[in-house]
């Protein structure tokens, strides 16, 4: 890994289990200043593997609201606008980090948690399962 | 929003700006126990809008490694295996939370940051831009 020289101005850690517990500033810095959400907002409808977005809410999690994609069809939309079943609409999934309140209902104490979310769908060619 | 009764066993917060700075346990809890990464590992190759994955590394960020998808073609792969340019391969993007070391090079102090990542690609029907 890369060794980082420690900044002498870092806060002290009184935690004996350091670095298991760290301080996190929740004032979110948004790096996405040059992106236009309008551009991709309708991909879910225009895709050959369209999807619906479902709201997943959990007050014990930060962020509390996550949108989950569910593919609309088993197959993919062809040039005629019909569903072709020799192709599969499949969800593209990504592992993301969220903060889980721990102990539960605590406003200022969290644990990092990895969850798998479906972001959208893509159209794939199925393959034959070759049995040995 | 939903009001959560506070757990009396919560850690105290000495921070006057509470809840801007919180304690986070970095021992990651993985909720993805029933998922098999084998399944989606080759979508990037089998998709009609295939993509390549590029490693984005930043030691000042947690997680330090993030994989970014870049669509291989402008168009989409058709039934004959050729690229059709009347359809567009587009990246599916998602805003995710990461931890940024703040002050820089500090091992136990972070700030939440939102970044936009491309997770994979999907094939969309282009739309005509109607000028008023």
């Amino acid at each position: 890994g890369i060794t980082i020289p420690r900044n002498p101005g870092c806060p002290n850690s009184e935690d004996k289990n350091f670095p298991r517990t760290v301080m996190v500033n929740l004032n979110i810095h948004n790096r996405n200043t040059n992106t236009n959400p309008k551009r991709s907002s309708d991909y879910y409808n225009r895709s050959t593997s369209p999807w619906n977005l479902h709201r997943n809410e959990d007050p014990e999690r930060y962020p509390s609201v996550i949108w989950e994609a569910k593919c609309r069809h088993l197959g993919c939309i062809n040039a005629d606008g019909n569903v072709d079943y020799h192709m599969n609409s499949v969800p593209i999934q990504q592992e993301i980090l969220v903060l889980r309140r721990e102990p539960p209902h605590c406003p200022n104490s969290f644990r990092l948690e990895k969850i798998l979310v479906s972001v959208g769908c893509t159209c794939v060619t199925p393959i034959v399962h070759h049995v040995a | 929003g939903i009001t959560i009764p506070r757990n009396p066993g919560c850690p105290n917060s000495e921070d006057k700006n509470f809840p801007r700075t919180v304690m986070v346990n970095l021992n990651i809890h993985n909720r993805n126990t029933n998922t098999n990464p084998k399944r989606s590992s080759d979508y990037y190759n089998r998709s009609t809008s295939p993509w390549n994955l590029h490693r984005n590394e930043d030691p000042e960020r947690y997680p330090s490694v993030i994989w970014e998808a870049k669509c291989r073609h402008l168009g989409c792969i058709n039934a004959d295996g050729n690229v059709d340019y009347h359809m567009n391969s587009v990246p599916i993007q998602q805003e995710i939370l990461v931890l940024r070391r703040e002050p820089p090079h500090c091992p136990n102090s972070f700030r939440l940051e939102k970044i936009l990542v491309s997770v994979g690609c999907t094939c969309v029907t282009p739309i005509v831009h109607h000028v008023a």
Partner: antibody, heavy 123, light 108 residues
């Protein structure tokens, strides 16, 4: 031995319900999408329903949509078909069939079949 | 909905003879057609998928051809165990597992 064994069939009155089960053995169950296909006495084959590896993709024939529910329990290597509001025309031998698609996806061809369980809907 | 029409309904042949079974689709299914064999009291068995690919363990005397709307299953030299009912099935359009009515190959 690689096999599929159906159970749960029987004689049932119109309008009533029945639950079919299919026990899989000899292969990694969650590597495959699974299906139910039926065959009325002396007739041809009719696809009823299919489900992918993690139940994220499910399909039904128009003739059973809204009445039948397919499900699976990967921990128990089992496939199920809950049949409600049964009709006389649902009388058939019900086969459990394994899809030949890789990664638990649909290919819509059936490489392994059970022996079937007979469902008779009659008053 | 695609309709698959198989012909003839019954084929009477002797062992050693060549069997030619036909399956016609009401609209193009490209090459996404499979063939199954079913013997009395048994479950169907996959023979051919994607028009011409033999499934695992299927003898070379079975072959498939065709694309679009017209498909053929050929058994080059009939063995006693080949007398059965044969079904074609498409996987292109909804419902994605439509079967033909079947062709019975019987001993002459």
């Amino acid at each position: 031995e690689v096999q599929l064994v159906e159970s749960g069939g029987g004689l049932v009155q119109p309008g009533r319900s029945l639950r079919l089960s299919c026990a899989a053995s000899g292969f990694t169950f969650d590597d495959y999408a699974m299906h139910w296909v039926r065959q009325a006495p002396g007739k041809g084959l009719e696809w009823v329903s299919g489900i992918n590896w993690n139940s994220g993709g499910i399909g039904y024939a128009d003739s059973v949509k809204g009445r039948f529910t397919i499900s699976r329990d990967n921990a128990k290597n089992s496939l199920y078909l809950q049949m409600n509001s049964l009709r006389a025309e649902d009388t058939a031998l019900y086969y459990c069939a394994r899809d030949m698609g890789g990664f638990g996806e649909f290919y819509w061809n059936f490489g392994l079949w059970g022996r079937g369980t007979l469902v008779t809907v009659s008053s | 909905e695609i309709v698959l029409t198989q012909s003839p309904a019954t084929l009477s042949l002797s062992p050693g003879e060549r069997a030619t079974l036909s399956c016609r689709a009401s609209q193009s299914v490209r090459s996404y057609l499979a063939w199954y064999q079913q013997k009395p009291g048994q479950a169907p068995r996959l023979l051919i998928y994607d028009a011409s690919n033999r499934a695992t363990g299927i003898p070379a005397r079975f072959s498939g051809s065709g694309s679009g709307t017209d498909f053929t299953l050929t058994i080059s030299s009939l063995e006693p165990e080949d007398f059965a009912v044969y079904y074609c099935q498409q996987r292109s359009n909804w419902p994605p597992a439509t079967f033909g009515g079947g062709t019975k190959v019987e001993i002459k």
